[in-house]
Interface confidence: low
Amino acid sequence: ARNGDHCPLGPGRCCRLHTVRASLEDLGWADWVLSPREVQVTMCIGACPSQFRAANMHAQIKTSLHRLKPDTVPAPCCVPASYNPMVLIQKTDTGVSLQTYDDLLAKDCHCI
Amino acid sequence: ARNGDHCPLGPGRCCRLHTVRASLEDLGWADWVLSPREVQVTMCIGACPSQFRAANMHAQIKTSLHRLKPDTVPAPCCVPASYNPMVLIQKTDTGVSLQTYDDLLAKDCHCI
């Protein structure tokens, strides 16, 4: 299958979704976001060994060329394949507003 | 601007489009592709320093958390923002066929 799901490095070490707890201060948002005070940021972390969750043909090419020219071509990288929306309560001049961000939390991951 | 385009590492060192010349053998395609014999593979290579070509909010978060927790959270990664199509002449049981691949050659790059 194009999108191999077996991680040769051991479980949890290849590209997958991780949760990182972050405060508004960590994110540099304290001056413009009221809530939530803490965000469970889902992000894509892990190695992308040969053909693991290859997103597309480009990722497969990258794997082949990285094997041949590791100093020139980097290995594929673990990035979001899609996102979950998140609502932030923001400070405004007149009070507060609710804003939905569609590109904030990773939903699932692939290698590209 | 959210997507800063100034590379603090020096010209050409940050995330951008590069061309890598590759033969069918390099790509492992010699058994199923007839033409072209050589591909000018456009791919995204380079560093993603703070806010450089940040693709979205997620990339900005990643930058912030990488600064705080560099061992846990990787820096954003240079990946294709879009692709150029490419036509391959493929071998088939009955002869040859033309197949267009939409996800083969990077067109432009961003950090995510």
Epitope: R2, D5, C7, G10, P11, R13, L17, A81, D108 | -
Partner: antibody, heavy 119, light 107 residues
Framework: EVQLVQSGAEVKKPGASVKVSCKAS????????LNWVRQATGQGLEWMGD????????IYNQKFKGRVTMTVDTSISTAYMELSSLRSEDTAVYYC????????????WGQGTLVTVSS | DIQMTQSPSSLSASVGDRVTITCKAS??????LAWYQQKPGKAPKLLIY???SLETGVPSRFSGSGSGTDYTFTISSLQPEDIATYYC?????????FGGGTKVEIK
Amino acid sequence: EVQLVQSGAEVKKPGASVKVSCKASGYTFTDYNLNWVRQATGQGLEWMGDLNPYNQGIIYNQKFKGRVTMTVDTSISTAYMELSSLRSEDTAVYYCAREGRGGAWFDSWGQGTLVTVSS
Amino acid sequence: DIQMTQSPSSLSASVGDRVTITCKASEDIYHRLAWYQQKPGKAPKLLIYGATSLETGVPSRFSGSGSGTDYTFTISSLQPEDIATYYCQQYWSPPFTFGGGTKVEIK
């Protein structure tokens, strides 16, 4: 032989918390992710989240976000799932399940822990 | 979240019959599908993973097929001990989700 042994049944009042344990044996504990799945009486299966004992990476089902906490004690090969602010609809059998080597299918399951929430 | 729609919700068949259960995902899950058997009062038991791979020790009368969004689970010759509820589960994208289950009974 792989075994996952869970703690015993619990009866809790609404608003309380429950902590279920899952002791693993028969394999290298840090080599496999552990998941928690629940099943209300006569209902289907619902995934709550998973925990990587190697690096303590956790993915929670957003449905339970803020109410569920998954932890691990690698020294005794035991995983824990704590659910807070219990309500009657949390009455269910809670299972721990070991993830497969190549993906999040569940190849070994605990015997289940019945949690009853009743006033 | 990826929704898994399993059908039928129940079926009745005779010993020796071929039994087929289908599972439809709300988006492509790239073969990341498992099938489980659950008997009353017991934990689920893994039968199939990767849409088609038979778990070690599972009888060969159980099989799986499919791709994209559509998957099928088959018992080639129903046996009395196969009476149970069967669930599909996707593990392409968290939250990992299960189908609603199919209760298999003997006629």
